[in-house]
């Protein structure tokens, strides 16, 4: 329905601290440099704006798009050209021009410092002083640092910290209280950050329907015994949840995710048996929750797929008449199927489905064509099933660093044009999938590896966009999304590579290493071992883990010397010495 | 080489039939799909139908219930029956190949030189 | 309702020009189902262009396109004298029925 005034409409449907933080994470996604006062100032004319219109929806622009009240905001901020270049020129547009300027300028990789956590007493001090202008802080920094969060989940987040914080706070021993918690939920922020990255492309790149063919099969495994024409509603109305929000409509975006959940609980009878927990929950952990809510018991008695898919008379037909309703279906049927599956595999699948009937409808005999495409899935079924295998094995001989490690040196070999803390970055990344699904049982590890191997590699992909320097890099991101993570797992050596020069400088450590925390630590290793394998590419496993072991005897040893320079200084041109030579 | 051919073009009156023929040469058709594809004199291309090589048909919207598409793969032809036809139907009709390895997608590489269609009375 | 929109409806140009000619498709075309015809007078069309990019075999290299979902571009690098035709995009949606072909952009010399 339409409404006089959009703002006031969105004010009074999400109430003023969640229009304030929404508000917030919008401009600070959009203009990543500016401060959280020049910000916050912003947000506080918007809110009494919305105030206005409230009280009267005819007041002067409360008719205007929030796209041209917020984009007016922004370029009205003083000395724009000078702080953000040729962002600039967006205000030279007009809407819905100007806001697509605004998205295109977004920064995956903002040069901003890393987010520091103040220790435990400052922390407790400044939040008790203001809470609401702590919480806004947190807002602030998450959202210029990942300008593609999901939004309203960032409103949960910061909702969780606040909830630690109250906790903690009143404890005598705040520090050990808040560092675990508070590691809790900015890990599971940040894999919230890439997976919504992922979607975002997903629908930039290829669309509305590449993501509702996700949701799809997303949904289908979550809620097996929904029907289909449940589970396609669902769907449409995720797919413009997040559509919204990957294009900056934050406000229609929360307010739509807040009417999917209600929308939710008040179906539960026809979608699933497991969302009582989650509908008890206040809003913004409804909506969390139902976003992982477990998986409800697939019915027992599915006929098998081949029935509706391949035995059918009516195949070719259906599929010609109506692509979309066909596929969609066959998509449901088998993602429901194949909780065990991750979403990726499924929509090769899919693809696959789809490419055989498109082959064989036209010929003299279709069902002799197109009749085995189901036993045709196995190949792509067992790759991924092998690579967590594989993967899991490697994780629990090797721990988490050791993997890391591994697979940093993989990929180093396999693109090593691209910069060392872009690999640095990726591998441990990758490397944390086995913390975060090997232990899990055996029919979740599959999902889990290789959606979130999927949402890291789209990353590495935005990143190498920026400043393209490897072609095997760029082979395996302009394809379909669903086909990166095959793709970059079959990338070898690149033969065309001509090795980096061996620069003493780049392997010379001070004792300043000594005192930095172990993540820090980890982060000057792996960076060394990465530039290893640029100099050598072809060293062997055997080469690299003399030099690895030799070098961190080397730090131990002078981490524990009583002078440390001293030790530094003269150990570390000998340790080089012997890195030159175990490689050549 | 490779051949389409239309005929049965001509003038007919309003309200009256036409079958055209498309007879191909120097492949087998009963392996192939085959579209009609009708041109207005100055106007742009419009698609009618298709015919799969297992003889199912599909049709334009705008096409279905006075045009059907048949084939005859002992004679390699394929045609295009025009029923109540009217002014408005007046164009070049052209039958042309759909590119092997697909089926629904509007990749035509082989065309027939076009026959022409005039309804008037 | 299907709509194939094609701009500019004609072109004139000169041997050596880059030539873009655009098609606009409502709503998306199926899983990049988009080819490009060039037409002489009194000729059949002629399949250049399938699956938005792939070049037809025996198809100059000049002649290229782009584009995915709803938005795509035929592009001829360097209009050469035998290039002035008629150009049609062609769709295909998630109903066969749907097929449907661009209104045509004429290329004319200057």
């Known amino acids: 329905e339409a409404h006089k005034s959009e703002i006031a409409h969105r004010y009074n449907d999400l109430g003023e601290q969640h229009f304030k933080g929404l508000v917030l994470i919008a401009f600070s996604q959009y203009l990543q440099k500016c401060s959280y006062d020049e910000h916050a100032k912003l947000v506080q004319e918007v809110t009494d704006f919305a105030k206005t219109c409230v009280a009267d929806e005819s007041a002067a622009n409360c008719d205007k798009s929030l796209h041209t009240l917020f984009g007016d905001k922004l370029c009205a901020i003083p000395n724009l050209r000078e702080n953000y270049g040729e962002l600039a020129d967006c205000c030279t547009k007009q809407e819905p021009e100007r806001n697509e300027c605004f998205l295109q300028h977004k920064d995956d990789n903002p040069s901003l410092p890393p987010f520091e956590r103040p220790e435990a007493e400052a922390m407790c001090t400044s939040f008790k002083e203001n809470p609401t202008t702590f919480m806004g802080h947190y807002l602030h920094e998450v959202a210029r640092r990942h300008p593609y969060f999901y939004a309203p989940e960032l409103l949960y987040y910061a909702e969780q910290y606040n909830e630690i914080l109250t906790q903690c706070c009143a404890e005598a021993d705040k520090e050990s209280c808040l560092t675990p918690k508070l590691d809790g939920v900015k890990e599971k922020a940040l894999v919230s950050s890439v997976r919504q990255r992922m979607k975002c492309s997903s629908m930039q790149k290829f669309g509305e329907r590449a993501f509702k063919a996700w949701a799809v099969a997303r949904l289908s495994q979550t809620f097996p015994n929904a029907d289909f024409a449940e589970i396609t509603k669902l769907a449409t109305d995720l797919t413009k949840v997040n559509k919204e929000c990957c294009h900056g409509d934050l406000l229609e975006c929360a307010d739509d995710r807040a009417e999917l959940a209600k929308y939710m609980c008040e179906n539960q009878a026809t979608i699933s048996s497991k969302l009582q927990t989650c509908c008890d929950k206040p809003l913004l952990k409804k909506a969390h929750c139902l976003s992982e809510v477990e998986h409800d018991t697939m019915p027992a008695d599915l006929p098998a797929i081949a029935a509706d898919f391949v035995e059918d008379q009516e195949v070719c037909k259906n599929y010609a008449e109506a692509k979309d309703v066909f596929l969609g279906t066959f998509l449901y049927e088998y993602s429901r199927r194949h909780p065990d599956y991750s979403v990726s595999l499924l929509l090769r699948l899919a693809k696959k489905y789809e490419a055989t009937l498109e082959k064989c409808c036209a010929e003299a005999n279709p069902p002799a064509c197109y009749g085995t495409v189901l036993a045709e899935f196995q190949p792509l079924v067992e790759e991924p099933k092998n690579l967590v295998k594989t993967n899991c094995d490697l994780y629990e001989k090797l721990g988490e660093y050791g993997f890391q490690n591994a697979i940093l040196v993989r990929y180093t070999q396999k693109a090593p044009q691209v910069s060392t803390p872009t690999l640095v970055e990726a591998a441990r990344n990758l490397g944390r999938v086995g913390t975060k699904c090997c232990t899990l049982p055996e029919d979740q590890r599959l999902p889990c590896v290789e959606d979130y191997l999927s949402a890291i590699l789209n990353r590495v992909c935005l990143l190498h966009e920026k400043t393209p320097v490897s072609e095997h890099v760029t082979k395996c991101c302009s394809g379909s999304l669903v086909e990166r993570r095959p793709c970059f797992s079959a990338l070898t050596v690149d033969e065309t590579y001509v090795p980096k020069e061996f620069k003493a400088e780049t392997f010379t450590f001070h004792s300043d290493i000594c005192t930095l925390p172990e993540k820090e630590k980890q982060i000057k290793k792996q960076t060394a071992l990465a530039e290893l394998v640029k100099h050598k590419p072809k060293a062997t496993a055997e080469q690299l883990k003399t030099v690895m072991d030799d070098f961190a005897q080397f730090l131990d040893t002078c981490c524990k010397a009583a002078d440390k320079d001293t030790c530094f200084s003269t150990e570390g041109p000998n340790l080089v010495t012997r890195c030159k030579d175990a490689l050549a | 080489e490779v051949q389409l051919l239309e005929s049965g073009g001509g003038l007919v009156q309003p309200g009256g039939s036409l079958r055209l023929s498309c007879a191909v040469s120097?492949?087998?058709?009963?392996?192939?799909?085959i579209n009609w594809v009708r041109q207005a004199p100055g106007k742009g291309l419009e698609w009618i139908g298709i015919i799969w090589a297992s003889g199912t048909t599909f049709y334009a919207t705008w096409a279905k219930g006075r045009f059907t598409i048949s084939r005859d793969n002992s004679k390699n032809t394929v045609y295009l029956q025009m029923n109540s036809l009217r002014a408005e139907d007046t164009a070049v009709y052209y039958c042309?190949?759909?590119?092997?390895?697909?089926?629904?997608?509007?990749?035509?590489?082989?065309w027939g030189q076009g026959t022409l269609v005039t309804v008037s009375s | 309702d299907i709509q194939m929109t094609q701009s500019p409806s004609s072109v004139s140009a000169s041997v050596g020009d880059r030539v873009t000619i655009t098609c606009q498709s409502s709503p998306s075309v199926w899983s990049n189902f988009l080819s490009w015809y060039q037409q002489k007078p009194g000729k059949a069309p002629k399949l250049l262009i399938y699956?938005?990019?792939k070049l037809t075999s025996g198809v100059p290299s000049r002649f290229s396109g782009s584009g995915s979902g709803t938005d795509f571009t035929l592009t001829i690098s360097s209009l050469q004298p035998e290039d002035f035709a008629t150009y049609y995009c062609g769709g295909g949606y998630s109903s066969i029925s749907d097929t449907t072909f661009g209104g045509g952009t004429k290329v004319e010399i200057k």
């Open positions: 120097g492949i087998d058709l009963s392996n192939y799909a």
């Open positions: 042309a190949r759909t590119v092997p390895g697909y089926s629904t997608a509007p990749y035509f590489d082989l």
């Open positions: 699956e938005a990019s």
